[in-house]
Amino acid sequence: ASGSASGSASTLVHNGTSARATTTPASKSTPFSIPSHHSDTPTTLASHSTKTDASSTHHSSVPPLTSSNHSTSPQLSTGVSFFFLSFHISNLQFNSSLEDPSTDYYQELQRDISEMFLQIYKQGGFLGLSNIKFRPG
Amino acid sequence: SVVVQLTLAFREGTINVHDVETQFNQYKTEAASRYNLTISDVSVSDVPFPFSAQSHHHHHH
Protein backbone atom coordinates (compact mmCIF):
# COMPACT_ATOMS: atom_id res chain seq x y z
CA ALA A 1 0.00 0.00 0.00
CA SER A 2 1.07 3.53 -0.48
CA GLY A 3 -0.11 6.99 0.18
CA SER A 4 -1.07 8.64 3.38
CA ALA A 5 -4.26 9.14 5.26
CA SER A 6 -4.49 12.85 5.28
CA GLY A 7 -6.67 15.76 4.39
CA SER A 8 -8.38 18.34 6.46
CA ALA A 9 -11.61 16.92 7.76
CA SER A 10 -12.27 19.20 10.70
CA THR A 11 -13.54 22.63 11.43
CA LEU A 12 -13.41 24.76 14.51
CA VAL A 13 -16.19 27.18 15.32
CA HIS A 14 -15.57 29.58 18.15
CA ASN A 15 -16.63 32.95 19.50
CA GLY A 16 -19.12 33.66 16.76
CA THR A 17 -16.81 33.03 13.86
CA SER A 18 -16.35 30.02 11.68
CA ALA A 19 -12.77 28.88 11.26
CA ARG A 20 -12.94 26.88 8.08
CA ALA A 21 -10.29 24.27 7.62
CA THR A 22 -9.30 25.73 4.31
CA THR A 23 -9.04 29.41 5.08
CA THR A 24 -9.11 30.87 8.52
CA PRO A 25 -6.52 30.27 11.24
CA ALA A 26 -7.87 28.73 14.40
CA SER A 27 -7.92 31.09 17.32
CA LYS A 28 -5.03 30.43 19.66
CA SER A 29 -7.20 31.49 22.58
CA THR A 30 -9.46 28.54 21.94
CA PRO A 31 -9.19 25.91 24.68
CA PHE A 32 -9.06 23.14 22.11
CA SER A 33 -9.04 22.37 18.46
CA ILE A 34 -9.28 19.19 16.46
CA PRO A 35 -6.43 17.83 14.36
CA SER A 36 -7.35 18.13 10.73
CA HIS A 37 -5.77 14.93 9.48
CA HIS A 38 -8.55 12.45 8.87
CA SER A 39 -6.43 9.42 9.56
CA ASP A 40 -6.72 5.80 10.47
CA THR A 41 -5.35 6.36 13.93
CA PRO A 42 -7.40 7.76 16.82
CA THR A 43 -7.68 11.51 16.89
CA THR A 44 -7.13 13.30 20.17
CA LEU A 45 -7.53 16.94 21.01
CA ALA A 46 -4.64 19.30 20.60
CA SER A 47 -4.34 22.35 22.81
CA HIS A 48 -4.18 24.61 19.79
CA SER A 49 -3.27 24.48 16.16
CA THR A 50 -2.16 26.81 13.43
CA LYS A 51 -3.53 26.31 9.98
CA THR A 52 -0.89 26.85 7.34
CA ASP A 53 -2.40 25.94 4.00
CA ALA A 54 -5.24 24.21 2.27
CA SER A 55 -5.35 21.21 4.51
CA SER A 56 -2.36 20.78 6.73
CA THR A 57 -2.19 21.58 10.39
CA HIS A 58 0.64 21.92 12.87
CA HIS A 59 -0.23 20.83 16.38
CA SER A 60 1.04 21.65 19.79
CA SER A 61 1.17 19.10 22.56
CA VAL A 62 -1.91 17.09 23.47
CA PRO A 63 -3.29 17.72 26.95
CA PRO A 64 -4.15 14.75 29.15
CA LEU A 65 -7.62 13.31 28.89
CA THR A 66 -9.45 12.95 32.17
CA SER A 67 -12.72 11.39 33.18
CA SER A 68 -15.17 12.63 35.75
CA ASN A 69 -17.66 10.75 37.87
CA HIS A 70 -20.20 13.55 37.98
CA SER A 71 -20.71 14.32 34.31
CA THR A 72 -22.88 12.86 31.59
CA SER A 73 -20.14 13.33 29.00
CA PRO A 74 -16.37 12.83 28.94
CA GLN A 75 -14.21 15.90 29.39
CA LEU A 76 -10.72 17.16 28.93
CA SER A 77 -8.89 18.57 31.89
CA THR A 78 -10.14 21.91 30.53
CA GLY A 79 -13.73 20.90 31.41
CA VAL A 80 -15.14 20.19 27.98
CA SER A 81 -18.09 17.90 27.17
CA PHE A 82 -18.45 16.30 23.73
CA PHE A 83 -21.51 15.10 21.87
CA PHE A 84 -21.69 13.08 18.68
CA LEU A 85 -24.39 14.33 16.32
CA SER A 86 -25.67 12.74 13.14
CA PHE A 87 -28.38 13.94 10.76
CA HIS A 88 -29.58 13.66 7.17
CA ILE A 89 -29.80 16.51 4.69
CA SER A 90 -32.47 15.19 2.38
CA ASN A 91 -32.39 17.93 -0.26
CA LEU A 92 -28.69 17.53 -1.05
CA GLN A 93 -27.01 14.85 -3.09
CA PHE A 94 -23.83 13.17 -1.91
CA ASN A 95 -20.94 13.02 -4.32
CA SER A 96 -17.31 12.03 -4.05
CA SER A 97 -16.13 15.62 -3.60
CA LEU A 98 -17.66 15.52 -0.11
CA GLU A 99 -14.81 13.21 0.84
CA ASP A 100 -12.25 15.93 0.19
CA PRO A 101 -12.02 19.19 2.14
CA SER A 102 -10.29 21.03 -0.71
CA THR A 103 -13.36 20.87 -2.96
CA ASP A 104 -15.86 23.70 -3.29
CA TYR A 105 -18.84 21.50 -2.42
CA TYR A 106 -17.23 20.31 0.81
CA GLN A 107 -16.20 23.83 1.81
CA GLU A 108 -19.58 25.39 1.09
CA LEU A 109 -21.49 22.72 3.00
CA GLN A 110 -19.04 22.81 5.88
CA ARG A 111 -19.34 26.59 6.07
CA ASP A 112 -23.16 26.49 6.11
CA ILE A 113 -23.20 23.80 8.78
CA SER A 114 -20.66 25.66 10.91
CA GLU A 115 -22.65 28.88 10.70
CA MET A 116 -25.86 27.01 11.45
CA PHE A 117 -24.48 25.53 14.66
CA LEU A 118 -23.29 28.94 15.78
CA GLN A 119 -26.86 30.14 15.36
CA ILE A 120 -28.37 27.18 17.19
CA TYR A 121 -26.09 27.14 20.21
CA LYS A 122 -25.64 30.82 20.90
CA GLN A 123 -25.35 30.36 24.62
CA GLY A 124 -21.94 30.82 26.22
CA GLY A 125 -21.23 27.14 26.73
CA PHE A 126 -20.78 26.26 23.04
CA LEU A 127 -17.12 25.86 22.17
CA GLY A 128 -17.17 24.48 18.66
CA LEU A 129 -17.65 21.59 16.31
CA SER A 130 -15.16 19.26 14.75
CA ASN A 131 -14.56 16.09 12.76
CA ILE A 132 -17.23 16.73 10.19
CA LYS A 133 -17.77 13.70 7.99
CA PHE A 134 -20.13 13.37 5.06
CA ARG A 135 -21.41 10.12 3.62
CA PRO A 136 -24.23 9.05 1.31
CA GLY A 137 -27.66 8.68 2.90
CA SER B 1 -29.24 12.58 0.61
CA VAL B 2 -26.16 13.44 2.65
CA VAL B 3 -25.52 12.10 6.13
CA VAL B 4 -23.55 14.51 8.32
CA GLN B 5 -21.61 13.31 11.34
CA LEU B 6 -19.75 15.63 13.66
CA THR B 7 -18.73 16.32 17.23
CA LEU B 8 -19.98 19.26 19.27
CA ALA B 9 -18.04 20.64 22.21
CA PHE B 10 -19.50 22.53 25.16
CA ARG B 11 -18.15 23.77 28.44
CA GLU B 12 -18.72 21.14 31.07
CA GLY B 13 -22.09 21.32 32.79
CA THR B 14 -23.70 23.80 30.39
CA ILE B 15 -25.84 21.36 28.40
CA ASN B 16 -26.91 17.73 28.26
CA VAL B 17 -27.69 15.32 25.42
CA HIS B 18 -31.42 15.99 25.55
CA ASP B 19 -30.98 19.75 25.29
CA VAL B 20 -28.47 19.45 22.46
CA GLU B 21 -31.00 17.44 20.48
CA THR B 22 -33.98 19.62 21.43
CA GLN B 23 -32.29 22.85 20.41
CA PHE B 24 -31.14 21.35 17.14
CA ASN B 25 -34.59 20.03 16.30
CA GLN B 26 -36.15 23.40 17.09
CA TYR B 27 -33.88 25.03 14.52
CA LYS B 28 -34.66 22.68 11.63
CA THR B 29 -37.31 24.93 10.06
CA GLU B 30 -35.03 27.94 10.13
CA ALA B 31 -32.18 25.87 8.71
CA ALA B 32 -34.37 25.04 5.73
CA SER B 33 -35.18 28.68 5.02
CA ARG B 34 -31.83 30.26 5.88
CA TYR B 35 -29.42 27.64 4.54
CA ASN B 36 -31.69 25.59 2.28
CA LEU B 37 -30.87 22.48 4.31
CA THR B 38 -33.73 20.05 4.89
CA ILE B 39 -32.72 18.19 8.04
CA SER B 40 -34.10 14.89 9.31
CA ASP B 41 -33.15 11.79 11.32
CA VAL B 42 -31.29 13.66 14.04
CA SER B 43 -29.35 11.56 16.51
CA VAL B 44 -27.27 12.83 19.44
CA SER B 45 -25.16 10.85 21.88
CA ASP B 46 -22.36 11.34 24.35
CA VAL B 47 -18.93 10.78 22.87
CA PRO B 48 -17.64 7.57 24.43
CA PHE B 49 -14.49 7.90 26.50
CA PRO B 50 -11.65 8.08 25.64
CA PHE B 51 -12.30 10.72 23.02
CA SER B 52 -11.06 9.61 19.63
CA ALA B 53 -12.03 9.85 16.02
CA GLN B 54 -12.57 6.11 15.97
CA SER B 55 -14.90 6.01 18.92
CA HIS B 56 -17.07 8.98 18.16
CA HIS B 57 -17.43 8.09 14.52
CA HIS B 58 -18.48 4.58 15.35
CA HIS B 59 -15.26 3.17 13.92
CA HIS B 60 -15.66 4.95 10.61
CA HIS B 61 -11.91 5.48 10.59
Epitope: S6, A9, T22, H38, A54, D100, P101, S102 | -
Partner: antibody, heavy 117, light 107 residues
Framework: EVQLVQSGAEVKKPGASVKVSCKAS????????INWVRQRPGQGLEWIGY????????EYNEKFKGRVTLTSDTSASTAYMELSSLRSEDTAVYYC??????????WGQGTLVTVSS | DIQLTQSPSSLSASVGDRVTITCRAS??????LNWLQQKPGKAIKRLIY???SLDSGVPSRFSGSRSGSDYTLTISSLQPEDFATYYC?????????FGGGTKVEIK
Protein backbone atom coordinates in the same frame (compact mmCIF):
# COMPACT_ATOMS: atom_id res chain seq x y z
CA GLU C 1 -0.94 -0.51 8.14
CA VAL C 2 -3.44 0.37 5.45
CA GLN C 3 -3.39 -2.00 2.52
CA LEU C 4 -5.34 -2.41 -0.69
CA VAL C 5 -4.65 -5.83 -2.15
CA GLN C 6 -5.93 -6.46 -5.66
CA SER C 7 -6.67 -9.74 -7.39
CA GLY C 8 -4.22 -11.36 -9.78
CA ALA C 9 -3.66 -10.90 -13.47
CA GLU C 10 -6.38 -12.01 -15.89
CA VAL C 11 -6.38 -13.01 -19.55
CA LYS C 12 -9.73 -12.64 -21.30
CA LYS C 13 -11.12 -13.03 -24.80
CA PRO C 14 -12.82 -10.15 -26.62
CA GLY C 15 -16.48 -9.85 -25.66
CA ALA C 16 -15.95 -11.46 -22.26
CA SER C 17 -16.18 -9.78 -18.83
CA VAL C 18 -13.62 -9.39 -16.07
CA LYS C 19 -14.12 -8.73 -12.38
CA VAL C 20 -11.21 -7.23 -10.45
CA SER C 21 -11.26 -7.20 -6.65
CA CYS C 22 -9.69 -4.79 -4.19
CA LYS C 23 -9.48 -6.05 -0.60
CA ALA C 24 -9.03 -3.48 2.10
CA SER C 25 -7.35 -3.98 5.43
CA UNK C 26 -6.00 -1.80 8.19
CA UNK C 27 -9.09 0.36 8.52
CA UNK C 28 -12.84 -0.01 8.77
CA UNK C 29 -14.05 -0.80 5.30
CA UNK C 30 -17.33 1.07 5.10
CA UNK C 31 -15.86 4.48 5.91
CA UNK C 32 -14.51 5.64 2.61
CA UNK C 33 -14.84 5.72 -1.12
CA ILE C 34 -12.82 3.78 -3.64
CA ASN C 35 -11.85 5.17 -7.03
CA TRP C 36 -10.93 2.92 -9.94
CA VAL C 37 -8.30 3.98 -12.46
CA ARG C 38 -6.71 2.20 -15.40
CA GLN C 39 -3.44 2.51 -17.27
CA ARG C 40 -3.06 1.11 -20.76
CA PRO C 41 0.40 -0.12 -21.82
CA GLY C 42 2.78 2.82 -22.19
CA GLN C 43 -0.09 5.25 -21.54
CA GLY C 44 -1.22 7.57 -18.79
CA LEU C 45 -3.90 7.12 -16.14
CA GLU C 46 -7.64 7.15 -16.79
CA TRP C 47 -10.39 7.46 -14.18
CA ILE C 48 -13.12 4.81 -14.41
CA GLY C 49 -15.40 5.52 -11.47
CA TYR C 50 -16.04 5.73 -7.75
CA UNK C 51 -18.00 3.78 -5.15
CA UNK C 52 -18.70 4.68 -1.54
CA UNK C 53 -18.19 1.44 0.31
CA UNK C 54 -21.10 -0.05 2.18
CA UNK C 55 -23.57 1.92 0.11
CA UNK C 56 -24.87 1.68 -3.42
CA UNK C 57 -23.54 5.14 -4.28
CA UNK C 58 -21.46 5.15 -7.47
CA GLU C 59 -20.10 7.60 -10.02
CA TYR C 60 -18.93 6.59 -13.48
CA ASN C 61 -16.87 8.11 -16.22
CA GLU C 62 -19.27 8.50 -19.16
CA LYS C 63 -16.73 6.73 -21.33
CA PHE C 64 -17.28 3.50 -19.38
CA LYS C 65 -20.99 3.83 -18.55
CA GLY C 66 -22.93 0.74 -19.48
CA ARG C 67 -19.81 -1.43 -19.51
CA VAL C 68 -18.50 -1.00 -15.98
CA THR C 69 -20.16 -1.94 -12.70
CA LEU C 70 -18.72 -1.06 -9.30
CA THR C 71 -19.88 -3.05 -6.28
CA SER C 72 -18.71 -3.83 -2.77
CA ASP C 73 -19.04 -6.61 -0.25
CA THR C 74 -18.65 -5.22 3.25
CA SER C 75 -18.51 -8.65 4.87
CA ALA C 76 -15.44 -9.45 2.76
CA SER C 77 -14.02 -5.91 2.98
CA THR C 78 -13.72 -5.97 -0.79
CA ALA C 79 -14.60 -3.65 -3.65
CA TYR C 80 -15.13 -4.93 -7.18
CA MET C 81 -14.84 -3.48 -10.66
CA GLU C 82 -16.49 -5.46 -13.44
CA LEU C 83 -15.89 -4.50 -17.06
CA SER C 84 -17.94 -6.20 -19.76
CA SER C 85 -17.81 -6.44 -23.55
CA LEU C 86 -14.03 -6.44 -23.42
CA ARG C 87 -12.01 -5.37 -26.42
CA SER C 88 -8.29 -5.33 -27.07
CA GLU C 89 -7.99 -1.68 -26.06
CA ASP C 90 -9.17 -2.62 -22.55
CA THR C 91 -5.82 -4.32 -22.00
CA ALA C 92 -4.49 -2.34 -19.08
CA VAL C 93 -3.45 -2.33 -15.45
CA TYR C 94 -6.47 -1.54 -13.28
CA TYR C 95 -5.94 0.23 -9.95
CA CYS C 96 -8.13 0.91 -6.95
CA UNK C 97 -7.44 3.97 -4.80
CA UNK C 98 -9.12 4.71 -1.50
CA UNK C 99 -10.00 7.95 0.19
CA UNK C 100 -8.76 8.82 3.64
CA UNK C 101 -10.06 12.25 4.52
CA UNK C 102 -9.11 13.23 1.00
CA UNK C 103 -9.34 11.54 -2.38
CA UNK C 104 -6.85 9.07 -3.87
CA UNK C 105 -4.80 8.71 -0.67
CA UNK C 106 -3.91 5.01 -0.92
CA TRP C 107 -3.42 2.89 -4.03
CA GLY C 108 -3.55 -0.83 -4.71
CA GLN C 109 -0.72 -2.59 -6.50
CA GLY C 110 -2.70 -2.91 -9.73
CA THR C 111 -4.19 -5.82 -11.70
CA LEU C 112 -3.13 -6.52 -15.26
CA VAL C 113 -6.02 -7.46 -17.54
CA THR C 114 -5.03 -8.72 -20.96
CA VAL C 115 -7.68 -8.98 -23.68
CA SER C 116 -6.55 -11.23 -26.49
CA SER C 117 -8.14 -13.69 -28.89
CA ASP D 1 -13.75 17.40 -19.37
CA ILE D 2 -10.92 19.26 -17.70
CA GLN D 3 -7.62 18.78 -19.50
CA LEU D 4 -4.33 18.71 -17.62
CA THR D 5 -1.33 19.49 -19.81
CA GLN D 6 1.78 18.20 -18.09
CA SER D 7 5.29 19.23 -19.06
CA PRO D 8 7.87 18.12 -19.76
CA SER D 9 6.90 14.59 -20.78
CA SER D 10 10.37 13.44 -19.80
CA LEU D 11 13.55 14.89 -18.39
CA SER D 12 17.06 13.76 -17.57
CA ALA D 13 18.62 14.96 -14.36
CA SER D 14 21.40 14.16 -11.94
CA VAL D 15 21.31 13.43 -8.24
CA GLY D 16 21.21 16.73 -6.39
CA ASP D 17 19.48 18.62 -9.21
CA ARG D 18 16.42 20.77 -8.66
CA VAL D 19 13.56 19.41 -10.76
CA THR D 20 10.34 21.21 -11.69
CA ILE D 21 7.28 19.62 -13.31
CA THR D 22 4.27 21.67 -14.37
CA CYS D 23 0.59 20.93 -14.99
CA ARG D 24 -1.68 23.45 -16.68
CA ALA D 25 -5.44 23.10 -16.14
CA SER D 26 -7.87 23.96 -18.93
CA UNK D 27 -10.46 25.20 -16.42
CA UNK D 28 -10.42 26.56 -12.90
CA UNK D 29 -9.82 23.71 -10.46
CA UNK D 30 -8.98 25.72 -7.34
CA UNK D 31 -6.61 23.70 -5.18
CA UNK D 32 -8.07 20.32 -6.10
CA LEU D 33 -4.91 18.82 -7.53
CA ASN D 34 -2.76 15.89 -6.39
CA TRP D 35 0.71 14.78 -7.44
CA LEU D 36 1.43 11.06 -7.78
CA GLN D 37 4.63 9.06 -8.12
CA GLN D 38 4.79 5.79 -10.06
CA LYS D 39 7.70 3.38 -10.08
CA PRO D 40 7.77 0.18 -12.15
CA GLY D 41 6.27 -2.76 -10.28
CA LYS D 42 5.27 -0.65 -7.28
CA ALA D 43 1.98 0.80 -6.13
CA ILE D 44 1.31 4.39 -7.09
CA LYS D 45 2.07 6.78 -4.25
CA ARG D 46 0.45 10.13 -3.60
CA LEU D 47 3.04 12.77 -2.74
CA ILE D 48 1.05 16.01 -2.62
CA TYR D 49 -2.66 16.61 -2.05
CA UNK D 50 -4.69 19.79 -2.38
CA UNK D 51 -1.98 21.46 -4.49
CA UNK D 52 0.57 22.01 -1.76
CA SER D 53 0.04 19.69 1.20
CA LEU D 54 2.69 17.04 1.70
CA ASP D 55 1.50 13.53 2.49
CA SER D 56 2.91 12.08 5.69
CA GLY D 57 6.10 10.15 5.16
CA VAL D 58 6.95 12.04 1.97
CA PRO D 59 10.36 13.75 2.12
CA SER D 60 10.31 17.53 2.45
CA ARG D 61 12.33 17.92 -0.74
CA PHE D 62 8.99 17.49 -2.54
CA SER D 63 6.74 20.54 -2.67
CA GLY D 64 3.72 21.72 -4.62
CA SER D 65 2.60 25.19 -5.60
CA ARG D 66 0.18 27.04 -7.82
CA SER D 67 0.26 30.15 -9.95
CA GLY D 68 -3.07 30.75 -11.64
CA SER D 69 -3.86 27.70 -13.74
CA ASP D 70 -0.29 26.38 -13.52
CA TYR D 71 0.52 23.81 -10.85
CA THR D 72 4.09 22.87 -10.05
CA LEU D 73 5.78 19.92 -8.40
CA THR D 74 9.31 20.71 -7.28
CA ILE D 75 11.98 18.28 -6.10
CA SER D 76 14.55 20.51 -4.45
CA SER D 77 17.42 18.02 -4.54
CA LEU D 78 16.86 14.91 -6.62
CA GLN D 79 17.71 11.63 -4.89
CA PRO D 80 18.35 8.21 -6.49
CA GLU D 81 14.96 6.93 -5.31
CA ASP D 82 13.16 9.83 -7.03
CA PHE D 83 13.72 8.52 -10.55
CA ALA D 84 10.14 7.66 -11.49
CA THR D 85 7.14 8.89 -13.45
CA TYR D 86 5.06 11.69 -11.94
CA TYR D 87 1.40 12.47 -12.65
CA CYS D 88 -0.90 15.32 -11.69
CA UNK D 89 -4.56 14.57 -10.98
CA UNK D 90 -7.49 16.97 -10.78
CA UNK D 91 -10.61 16.15 -8.79
CA UNK D 92 -12.48 19.43 -9.16
CA UNK D 93 -15.10 17.88 -11.39
CA UNK D 94 -16.02 14.52 -12.81
CA UNK D 95 -14.61 12.85 -14.76
CA UNK D 96 -11.42 13.17 -12.77
CA UNK D 97 -8.48 13.53 -15.11
CA PHE D 98 -4.73 13.07 -15.07
CA GLY D 99 -1.80 14.77 -16.71
CA GLY D 100 0.13 12.81 -19.29
CA GLY D 101 2.99 12.06 -16.94
CA THR D 102 6.62 13.13 -16.61
CA LYS D 103 9.33 10.50 -16.64
CA VAL D 104 12.36 11.57 -14.61
CA GLU D 105 15.43 9.69 -15.81
CA ILE D 106 19.06 9.57 -14.77
CA LYS D 107 21.31 11.79 -16.86
Amino acid sequence: EVQLVQSGAEVKKPGASVKVSCKASGYTFTSYGINWVRQRPGQGLEWIGYIYLGSDYTEYNEKFKGRVTLTSDTSASTAYMELSSLRSEDTAVYYCARSAGSLFAYWGQGTLVTVSS
Amino acid sequence: DIQLTQSPSSLSASVGDRVTITCRASQDIGITLNWLQQKPGKAIKRLIYATSSLDSGVPSRFSGSRSGSDYTLTISSLQPEDFATYYCLQYASSPYTFGGGTKVEIK
